[in-house]
Amino acid sequence: MMTGTIETTGNISAEKGGSIILQCHLSSTTAQVTQVNWAQQDQLLAICNADLGWHISPSFKDRVAPGPGLGLTLQSLTVNDTGEYFCIYHTYPDGTYTGRIFLEVLESSVAEHGARFQIP
């Protein structure tokens, strides 16, 4: 019986050009985690494997950093990064647990642009 639960950062937002940490935590189970996959919709972003460590998909290597912990850091965000992200925990003996995070990447506000280029 699968007793565990995945806690995630839920719905989050970040600014275009910035970075964000995607974080999931598996709790309420003594199942041992053997691998964690991170995916954006159907695209695999990264894998953290018990034996092999981290593997970042080649197409995301420049913008995805492993960690902290089993989390994932997305950098140089674009509006196209808006969408659903999934953490998939492969465990023994329970099986697979999946957590969902929705990320919205926002254009920088006009006010902030104004402040940034203000003449002293």
Partner: antibody, heavy 119, light 113 residues
Framework: EVQLVESGGGLVKPGGSLKLSCAAS????????MSWVRQTPEKRLEWVAY????????YYPDTVKGRFTISRDNAKNTLYLQMSSLKSEDTAIYYC????????????WGQGTTLTVSS | DIVMSQSPSSLAVSVGEKVTMTCKSS????????????LAWYQQKPGQSPKLLIY???TRESGVPDRFTGSGSGTDFTLTISSVKAEDLAVYYC?????????FGGGTKLEIK
């Protein structure tokens, strides 16, 4: 160089309480899971508590569940073990040990601190 | 709980001899999805804390001399020291990290003749 230094051991009466500490240095403490493992006077090794990297998950064997509490302060690079309702069979050397994420063996151990439970 | 049994409990050998010690688990430590055996070996020298030698049953930890070899799968595991040195005087423990609670064998004490 990885260093784990335990402290807080001593002589306690049965039913008493004690808190052990483990100061970590030489590595990114918050990136590792941690455990406490004890060695009995008969030299047997027993795992007694586990905490995940961010402190979200803790696990204990039935022998100490409800009596021992593991915690960590990642800002201070310190691991703790709060022990209560102590019994004579808890007498042991207590080691803190580091675990790589998703790997549950112990890759570094401290030098240990001794707990004696006796009236 | 998984019970780990080690044999012999002690043995005495001369420097240069080959040594084999065994560790048996009460259930398989092989995880089918990654074909890894969740077993580690530790060395504890007199007055010191345990030191990791082998993990995944056969992977030598960085810095461990190649005279130490781990083998086996499922429930039967072996630690071999190909040519014993005086500094190998220690107690050797196996540990399963396949499932909670993690458990250790009782140890094999290696003495030098």
């Amino acid at each position: 160089e990885v260093q784990l230094v335990e402290s807080g051991g001593g002589l306690v009466k049965p039913g008493g309480s004690l808190k052990l500490s483990c100061a970590a240095s030489g590595f990114a403490f918050s990136d590792y899971d941690m455990s406490w493992v004890r060695q009995t006077p008969e030299k047997r090794l027993e795992w007694v508590a586990y905490i995940s990297d961010g402190g979200y998950n803790t696990y204990y064997p039935d022998t100490v569940k409800g009596r021992f509490t593991i915690s960590r302060d990642n800002a201070k690079n310190t691991l703790y073990l709060q022990m209560s309702s102590l019994k004579s069979e808890d007498t042991a050397i207590y080691y803190c040990a580091r675990q790589i994420l998703l790997r549950y063996y112990f890759d570094y151990w401290g030098q240990g601190t001794t707990l004696t439970v006796s009236s | 709980d998984i019970v780990m049994s080690q044999s012999p409990s002690s043995l005495a050998v001369s420097v240069g001899e080959k040594v084999t010690m065994t560790c048996k688990s009460s259930q398989s430590l092989l995880y089918s999805s990654n074909q890894k055996n969740y077993l580690a070996w530790y060395q504890q020298k007199p007055g010191q804390s345990p030191k990791l030698l082998i993990y995944w049953a056969s992977t030598r930890e960085s810095g461990v001399p190649d005279r130490f070899t781990g083998s086996g799968s499922g429930t039967d595991f072996t630690l071999t020291i190909s040519s014993v040195k005086a500094e190998d005087l220690a107690v050797y423990y196996c540990q399963q990290y396949h499932s909670y609670p993690w458990t250790f064998g009782g140890g094999t004490k290696l003495e030098i003749k």
